[in-house]
Interface confidence: low
């Protein structure tokens, strides 16, 4: 529908509260360094303008596109050049180039201070003093640190955040009530951000076709009773929603997501039997619930895939007539039969099938040529199965922390040029696959593990893209979206790497480590482990384990000492000397 005023249309559809929240998210995701107060001022100005357009859609400037209105507003920021440098050059461009320019300057790793959680009483006072500002600040802080966070989902997180404070600030034991809820929101938020980042990378780096293939596979697993036409419609709508959100069109994205949830609930009889509970919830909860809904049961009487895709004499005819539709049908049929496969595996199988048809449909005897295509799938299926089995065994043997350390060593040896904080962050997240997925039975392990690893490896890819240092990382990240994990798995020790110079300062620790949380202490130790491997990439597991055990004992000893700082200074020197000797540094 063409609307005289796009801003009025979205304001009316979304309502003032959601409109303001989404504009704040959009601005914070673009101008990540701007102070909170500046953003609030800009949002209020946009909101007041939107209200004039609601009152009279013909009023001046109300016919302008949202990109034009928002871009003009962002370009009024006085310190744009000083704060953002070359991003200020975006303001010299016209739409749509200006918006594209802003998008390209989004920073996945902005130089912002870590969010420190204040005392519970301090938070509760702030919440009670000014609830609206408190919640806006939450949106702002998350959005600027996660510039691709799925905006309508962030509204859902904010709603839960508010509910947690509303309940817990009246509780007898505020901390016991609030802290687990905040921990859960933080962990879920990080996971949600990373999942959405992969969707945006898929769209932006590999195109709409790649995203649609992913969506066909995932929705077919989730809704195996739905017809192919129904799945295709959902895929088209979902692609539009994510294209909008990844492109910074947050008002359109939230509006279209609400429409999609409405459609799904109105047509749940032809989509899935698992949607009933979701569809009884309010809008934000409903959309979240649908996105997370469990797979429906597979129809009992599904025929063999071979009939339509191998044995039929019409395979090449059907393929030639509408390649993507035919491949989409193949992917749909395979995925709905295999909830036990990861989405990326299903996409590898579809790619293999496509390559085979491309080759065979031009051959003298096409059927003879593609008759054994399903045999080519066996090694593709077995590779992730074996990898997951081996790694879950290792995880169960070591526990999460030591499993993370094994991955830290493995990945540092593969790509030692990558920055230490990135290697620590990515390897810690890779290691979490154990706790997340190894508890599942066989049938759920692969979709859990491999699709999670795709999300984590995408974090490595986007962080590395900002400052590329390794050709091997660039190669694995850019060649094929679905083969990223096998590509990284196949990397061996980088023999071309020149070991880092030894620097005693890197291994100097102070008494402040004693007051850190267990997680922060682990990160310190893991940072030292990465540095150790960078100095001595040929060190054996046993050598590294010995040094790390000594290091743990040293920290424990000095944290119990009366004069902690002296202990760290003196014992630290001894530890460095002993480690150098043990590793031959």
């Amino acid at each position: 529908d063409a609307h005289k005023s796009e801003v009025a249309h979205r304001f009316k559809d979304l309502g003032e509260e959601n409109f303001k929240a989404l504009v704040l998210i959009a601005f914070a995701q673009y101008l990540q360094q701007c102070p909170f107060e500046d953003h609030v001022k800009l949002v209020n100005e946009v909101t007041e303008f939107a209200k004039t357009c609601v009152a009279d859609e013909s009023a001046e400037n109300c016919d302008k596109s949202l990109h034009t209105l928002f871009g003009d507003k962002l370009c009024t920021v006085a310190t744009l050049r000083e704060t953002y440098g070359e991003m200020a050059d975006c303001c010299a461009k016209q739409e749509p180039e200006r918006n594209e320019c802003f998008l390209q300057h989004k920073d996945d790793n902005p130089n912002l201070p870590r969010l420190v959680r204040p005392e519970v009483d301090v938070m509760c006072t702030a919440f009670h003093d000014n609830e609206e500002t408190f919640l806006k600040k939450y949106l702002y802080e998350i959005a600027r640190r996660h510039p691709y966070f799925y905006a309508p989902e962030l509204l859902f997180f904010a709603k839960r955040y508010k509910a947690a404070f509303t309940e817990c600030c009246q509780a007898a034991d505020k901390a016991a009530c609030l802290l687990p809820k905040l921990d859960e929101l933080r962990d879920e938020g990080k996971a949600s951000s990373a999942k959405q980042r992969l969707k945006c990378a898929s769209l932006q780096k590999f195109g709409e076709r790649a995203f649609k293939a992913w969506a066909v596979a995932r929705l077919s697993q989730r809704f195996p009773k739905a017809e192919f036409a129904e799945v295709s419609k959902l895929v088209t709508d979902l692609t539009k929603v994510h294209t909008e959100c990844c492109h910074g069109d947050l008002l359109e994205c939230a509006d279209d997501r609400a429409d999609l949830a409405k459609y799904i609930c109105e047509n749940q009889d032809s989509i899935s039997s698992k949607l009933k509970e979701c569809c009884e919830k309010p809008l934000l909860e409903k959309s979240h619930c649908i996105a997370e809904v469990e797979n429906d049961e597979m129809p009992a009487d599904l025929p063999s895939l071979a009939a339509d895709f191998v044995e039929s004499k019409d395979v090449c005819k059907n393929y030639a007539e509408a390649k993507d539709v035919f491949l989409g049908m193949f992917l749909y049929e395979y995925a709905r039969r295999h909830p036990d496969y990861s989405v990326v595996l299903l996409l590898r199988l579809a790619k293999t099938y496509e390559t085979t048809l491309e080759k065979c449909c031009a051959a003298a005897d096409p059927h003879e040529c593609y008759a054994k295509v399903f045999d080519e799938f066996k090694p593709l299926v077995e590779e992730p199965q074996n990898l997951i089995k081996q790694n879950c065994e290792l995880f169960e043997q070591l526990g999460e922390y030591k499993f993370q350390n094994a991955l830290l060593v493995r990945y540092t040896k593969k790509v030692p040029q990558v920055s230490t904080p990135t290697l620590v962050e990515v390897s810690r997240n890779l290691g979490k696959v154990g706790s997340k997925c190894c508890k599942h039975p066989e049938a759920k392990r692969m979709p859990c593990a491999e699709d999670y690893l795709s999300v984590v490896l995408n974090q490595l890819c986007v962080l590395h893209e900002k400052t590329p240092v390794s050709d091997r990382v660039t190669k694995c990240c850019t060649e094929s979206l679905v083969n990223r994990r096998p590509c990284f798995s196949a990397l061996e020790v980088d023999e071309t790497y020149v070991p880092k110079e030894f620097n005693a300062e890197t291994f100097t620790f102070h008494a402040d480590i004693c007051t850190l949380s267990e997680k922060e202490r682990q990160i310190k130790k893991q940072t030292a482990l990465v540095e150790l491997v960078k100095h001595k990439p040929k060190a054996t597991k046993e050598q590294l384990k010995a040094v790390m055990d000594d290091f743990a004992a040293f920290v424990e000893k000095c944290c119990k000492a009366d004069d902690k700082e002296t202990c760290f200074a003196e014992e630290g020197k001894k530890l460095v000397a002993a480690s150098q000797a043990a590793l031959g540094l």
Partner: nanobody, 115 residues
Framework: EVQLVESGGGLVQPGGSLRLSCAAS????????MSWFRQAPGKEREFVSA????????RYAESVKGRFTISRDNSKNTLYLQMNSLRAEDTAVYYC????????GGQGTTVTVSS
């Protein structure tokens, strides 16, 4: 399939004691941190206590500190919660969960503290 089965609940007088157990199966128990949560009638689930995979690191809600003790026996795949000096406000259904997530767990065991 992952299974968590809580037991040991019952009716007890204020000041009394109970020991809850949680038998785990379907996953490698010794590799995961575990928690106890509880839910009183008409209230949200609340965190009670947590223990790391090896049993060394334990956490408690302020309201139970000094009265409850969490422990585990990895050889028996079992999590425990020793509850002493019980109060009326401890009345709830107690659930054990994997990790620190309040959203997953077994069916629960009911503890009623009343005179």
């Amino acid at each position: 399939e992952v299974q968590l089965v809580e037991s040991g609940g019952g009716l007890v007088q204020p000041g009394g004691s109970l020991r809850l157990s949680c038998a785990a199966s379907g996953f490698t128990f010794g590799s995961f941190g575990m928690s106890w949560f509880r839910q009183a009638p008409g209230k949200e689930r609340e965190f009670v206590s947590a223990i790391d995979s090896g049993g060394a690191d334990t956490r408690y809600a302020e309201s139970v500190k000094g009265r409850f003790t969490i422990s585990r026996d990895n050889s028996k795949n079992t999590l425990y919660l020793q509850m002493n000096s019980l109060r009326a406000e401890d009345t709830a259904v107690y659930y054990c969960t994997i990790g620190r997530s309040a959203s997953r767990g077994g069916q629960g065991t009911t503890v009623t503290v009343s005179s």
